[in-house]
């Protein structure tokens, strides 16, 4: 067991251009605090994985009000160290996340006015008992300077806090099989401390806190004798005559898990799966608190006001759940209107709008015809997010700027000849055909399939297409 200690030296603008704006103002004074989350190992763990080594929240720093016009200075910091106790061995390699939070002190009603200013993360090697290590990390335009160390809590010593030491009982030497504790030569390695209550006669341990049973004994503390039985069933009636060894009462018999925990048997004993708010071997420890670092993904933990809110995680945008463990698929709510494409960038939502639409959610239908002139007497028609010109006769193209060749599509049927005309086209029909497009045959007896031709037009005259 031991403690990881973090000392924040400064938080302020980093070097280089683009100094950040002060997070506080005369209208909105604020103060800073920090959260540290530790995970074992050097692997790139998911941001939402728990702070398995522990977490801690600093006190609030002094209230700070920005001086108008002044650049953001190093901001006033909370007093004291951030301390993260660890119960087991120090892993030697660890990952950290240090978050800088701002608490606004205006008169907001209804919710905490907290916001995450900066988050830095890293992976380091560190031996327990060593000197303070100094570090500088940058997050955007901000710079965080800090030191950290891991120290063992007596009687643990060593680079992993796994060796236990006791003052010597005799002035000259340590007991049988026990070495002096370097560098504390006046102390001796102590026997391992087994799990509390582990039977001294029937149990032993190879790691601190465990309890392994000698043959013939079982149970979490090696206090339950293995019974002899008829072997007819795993929990069969006891009979000393067969000499057959079977397990005695099962480790989950009577459910040793308190507070609604569920028990499952393991090769050695049992394991309790605890409901939220409880932990410990038998779920006997109530009230997971903020010190246990229950909030993931940069969620801010505050103690609750009643037993069902033992701790509360205030989640950053994009996360939800009682521990901020769930990423919100904000695009599933289809926030982008008018067929816009939704992009969840984590810190924000973006909508990529189709042509003709604009606004944060593509909610504005642009006036497609605004500033769009259709040439040569064409008129603009809005529709579907794009403008279209309805062109006057003889003109075409997107803006009616192109002179149309009405004969290009060969509109005259049955070999009729096409002539371009200022008002459109005219078909000169081949003998035996008539109509605007020469589409009607003239009957051999001279009668037409159409009603009589209008006065002044004989069948076979070119028909003008109006």
């Amino acid at each position: 067991a031991g403690v990881f200690e973090l000392q924040i030296h400064s938080f302020g603008p980093g070097p280089g251009p683009g100094a950040p704006r002060s997070p506080c103002s005369a209208r909105l004074p604020c103060r800073l605090f920090f959260r540290v989350c530790l995970k074992p190992g050097l692997s790139e763990e998911a941001a939402e994985s728990p702070c398995a080594l522990g977490a801690a929240l600093s006190a609030r720093g002094p209230v700070y009000t920005e001086q108008p016009g002044a650049p953001a200075p190093d901001l006033p910091l909370p007093d004291g160290l951030l301390q993260v106790p660890f119960r087991d061995a120090w892993p030697g390699t660890f990952s950290f996340i240090i978050e800088t939070w701002r608490e606004e002190l205006g008169d907001q009603i209804g919710g905490p006015a907290w916001s995450l200013l900066a988050r830095v993360a890293g992976r380091r090697r560190l031996a327990a008992g060593g000197p303070w290590a100094r570090d500088i990390q940058r997050a955007g335009a901000w710079e965080l300077r800090f030191s950290y160390r891991a120290r063992c809590e007596p009687p643990a010593v060593g680079t992993a806090c796994t060796r236990l030491c006791r003052p010597r009982s005799a002035p000259s030497r340590c007991g049988p099989g026990l070495r002096p504790c370097a560098p504390l030569e006046d102390e001796c390695e102590a026997p391992l401390v087994c799990r509390a209550g582990c039977s001294p006669e029937h149990g032993f341990c190879e790691q601190p806190g465990e309890c392994r049973c000698l043959e013939g004994w079982t149970g979490p503390l090696c206090t339950v004798p293995v019974s002899t039985s008829s072997c007819l069933s795993p929990r069969g009636p006891s009979s000393a005559t067969t000499g057959c060894l079977v397990p005695g009462p099962g480790p989950c018999d009577g459910n040793p898990c308190a507070n609604g925990g569920s028990c499952s048997e393991t090769p050695r004993s049992f394991e309790c799966t605890c409901p939220r708010g409880f932990y410990g071997l038998r779920c006997e420890v109530s009230g997971v608190t903020c010190a246990d670092g229950p909030c993931f993904n940069g969620g801010l933990c505050v103690g609750g006001a009643d037993p069902d809110s033992a701790y509360i995680c205030h989640c950053p945008p994009g996360f939800q759940g009682s521990n901020c463990e769930k990423r919100v698929d904000r695009c599933s709510l289809q926030p982008c209107r008018n067929g816009g494409l939704c992009l969840d960038l984590g810190h924000a939502l973006r909508c990529r709008c189709r042509a003709g639409f604009a606004g944060p959610r593509c909610e504005h239908d642009l006036d497609d015809c605004a500033g769009r002139a259709c040439a040569n007497g064409g008129t603009c028609v809005e529709g579907g997010g794009a403008h279209r010109c309805s062109c006057a006769l003889g003109f075409g193209g997107r803006d009616c700027r192109e002179r149309a060749d009405p004969c290009a599509a060969r509109p005259c049927a049955h070999g009729g000849r096409c002539y371009a005309h200022f008002s459109g086209l005219v078909c000169a029909c081949a003998p035996g055909y008539m109509g605007a497009r020469c589409e009607f045959p003239v009957h051999p007896d001279g009668a037409s399939a159409l009603p009589a031709a209008p006065p002044g037009l004989r069948p076979g005259d070119p028909q003008r297409y109006l």
Partner: antibody, heavy 117, light 109 residues
């Protein structure tokens, strides 16, 4: 802003019944436990009842003074909290408040229940 | 049934620091009692000040703070103002039952 609005108070005779309602807005009602608290005229505060959320099986708890007479319930779909009061006594006369404990304590404006012959 | 005890009345002057306490008949108050403090002003106007021992509501002035002092929960007003004159109730949770103290009448002269 969290809002709690109580209704349903009034004048009732001893042994009579009354049902109080509390409309809740601006927070995820389904997630949290809810409470009723009362204050008799000129007296201090007295906790009356508590109902937990669905994941805690809507477990209910009562002050000894109202046990077996009052019933707390909730309608998560409507974000409503209720207190059914039966067999009312003169000492139940009080201002009744819907109270929500989360990171802080949130109070409604109260509704007055008067039990009088 | 637990009993929660508060000072019945306290008097302070503007600018002074005053501490109100909340004692439990069952032993030391701990964070598992989720001590909360409520202010009552005339006309049944209740305001939650502190929840969970030391969480101050964002709308509450910074001069109010909650803590555990010895075996009691405490509400400290650093630099009392005349508008802080009110009755202050503390509430303690015992599992799923809430017990209120009798209230402290604070006078700011």
């Amino acid at each position: 802003e969290v809002q709690l609005v109580e209704t349903g108070g009034g004048l009732v005779q001893p042994k009579g019944s009354l049902k109080l309602s509390c409309a809740v807005s601006a927070f995820t009602f389904t997630t949290y436990a809810m409470n009723w608290v009362r204050q008799a005229p000129g007296k201090g505060l007295e906790w009356v009842a508590r109902i937990r959320n669905k994941s805690n099986n809507y477990a209910t708890y009562y002050a000894d003074s109202v046990k077996d007479r009052f019933t707390i319930s909730r309608d998560d779909s409507q974000s409503m909290l209720y207190l059914q009061m039966n067999n009312l006594k003169i000492e139940d006369t009080a201002m009744y408040y819907c109270v929500f404990y989360y990171d802080y304590v949130y109070w409604g404006q109260g509704t007055l229940v008067t039990v009088s012959a | 049934q637990a009993v929660v005890t508060q000072e019945s009345a306290l008097t302070t002057s503007p600018g002074e620091t005053v501490t109100l306490t909340c004692r439990s008949s069952t032993g030391a108050v701990t964070t598992s009692n989720y001590a909360n403090w409520i202010q009552e002003k005339p006309d049944h106007l209740f305001t939650g000040l502190i929840g969970g021992t030391n969480n101050r509501h964002p709308g509450v002035p910074a001069r109010f703070s909650g803590s555990l002092i010895g075996d009691k929960a405490a509400l400290t007003i650093t630099g009392a103002q005349t508008e802080d004159e009110a009755i202050y109730f503390c509430g303690l949770w015992y599992s799923n039952h809430l017990v209120f103290g009798g209230g402290t009448k604070l006078t700011v002269l």
